[in-house]
Interface confidence: low
């Protein structure tokens, strides 16, 4: 099942949206998220702890939208119209992996299983919502 399927029931029973509190994920084009996120973290604090591991990579700048992509999984966009978190689309993931995985290897990192691009929707459509690369994130 792809992440981000549209729910006509408008999120009945889903956790409410909450303000993005993770410093790395502020000012990226949306400001509401929902927990648990797409990686199973139940709180933003828990998500932030893992996300911080990528800080050197974001600073390195291997991919212009890496921060946006990571935040789309760790603090995915939330809207009251959709019951599930909305991740980035697969092409953004694949570009980030292509450019950043070789750099990660230099830092003794492997590209994490949790960032498996195959789990993400191929493109944004009403049946599998996802976010395209932003203009200026």
């Amino acid at each position: 099942l792809e992440i981000g399927r549209f729910d006509p029931e408008r999120g009945r029973g889903a956790a409410p949206c909450q303000a993005v509190e993770i410093p790395m994920c502020r000012g990226i084009g949306y400001n509401l998220t929902r927990m648990p996120n797409l990686l199973g973290h139940t709180s933003q604090g828990e998500a932030a702890a893992e996300l911080a591991e990528f800080a050197p990579l974001v600073q390195y700048g291997c991919h212009s939208h890496l921060r946006f992509f990571l935040c789309s999984l760790y603090a995915p966009m939330c809207t009251d119209q959709v019951s599930t978190p909305i991740p980035a689309c697969r092409p953004m993931c694949e570009q980030a992996r292509l450019r950043c995985a070789p750099i990660m290897e230099q830092f003794n990192f492997g590209w994490p299983d949790s960032l498996d691009c195959a789990r993400l929707p191929t493109r944004n459509d009403p049946h599998a919502l996802c976010m395209e690369a932003p203009e200026n994130a």
């Epitope: 702890a49 911080a52 591991e53 800080a55 003794n108 492997g110 299983d113």
Partner: antibody
Framework: QVQLVQSGAEVKKPGSSVKVSCKAS????????ISWVRQAPGQGLEWVGR????????NYAQKFQGRVTITADESTSTAYMELSSLRSEDTAVYYC???????????WGQGTLVTVSS | EIVLTQSPATLSVSPGERATLSCRAS??????LAWYQQKPGQAPRLLIY???TRATGIPARFSGSGSGTEFTLTISSLQSEDFAVYYC?????????FGQGTKVEIK
């Protein structure tokens, strides 16, 4: 390349606490992940927990939850591991190491022997 | 938690011979597995990360392979300084876990 230097050996009484330090030099400390791993005499390696200094957020192995506190001082690039309610089975060499989530451990500190004995 | 089982517990090998060490995970760890060497009285030293990538300064006689649940560390021609204990470790999920170790001793 980061280098990690640990504090010296400690002898403690059962029920007391110990605080071991790990000073980093030669690389980014704040955005690193610093883990603590222990090794009882003649035994294997056991992960205790880790901290990301820039966040101050620590994760602990379930076994040590409630007894261990890992902290970091960014101003001195030093990580600390405090273990309380010590018992004889806590006698071990405690290592700090860089890494600990999606990352292997490298480098390692030289180790600190903590002996718990009455 | 993910359990890593190393085999054999002890491996007796003559210098110059090939040594093959195994590490099996109770569930998939992808390629997020490392190998360490530890000599008496010393801290562990990273040999292999990402299941197959040699760490900086590690001789080419050390190689790692595998993914998922089955991993192998191979030392192609044992030197005297290679006799030590070897540990595998997964960094795919919490809690981080180590294998129990394989001791490589002189035959």
């Amino acid at each position: 390349q980061v280098q990690l230097v640990q504090s010296g050996a400690e002898v403690k009484k059962p029920g007391s606490s110990v605080k071991v330090s790990c000073k980093a030099s030669g690389g980014a400390f704040s955005t690193s992940s610093i883990s603590w791993v222990r090794q009882a005499p003649g035994q294997g390696l056991e992960w205790v927990g880790r901290i990301i200094p820039v966040l101050g957020t620590a994760n602990y192995a379930q076994k040590f939850q409630g007894r261990v506190t890992i902290t970091a001082d960014e101003s001195t690039s030093t990580a600390y591991m405090e273990l309380s309610s010590l018992r004889s089975e806590d006698t071990a060499v405690y290592y700090c190491a860089k890494g600990g989530w999606r990352s292997s451990f490298d480098p390692w500190g030289q180790g600190t022997l903590v002996t718990v004995s009455s | 938690e993910i359990v890593l089982t190393q085999s054999p517990a002890t491996l007796s090998v003559s210098p110059g011979e090939r040594a093959t060490l195994s590490c099996r995970a109770s569930q998939s760890v992808s390629s997020n597995l490392a190998w360490y060497q530890q000599k008496p009285g010393q801290a562990p030293r990273l040999l292999i990360y990402g299941a197959s990538t040699r760490a900086t300064g590690i001789p080419a006689r050390f190689s790692g392979s595998g993914s998922g649940t089955e991993f192998t560390l191979t030392i192609s021609s044992l030197q005297s300084e290679d006799f030590a204990v070897y540990y595998c470790q997964q960094y795919n999920s919490w809690p981080l876990t180590f294998g129990q170790g394989t001791k490589v001793e002189i035959k």
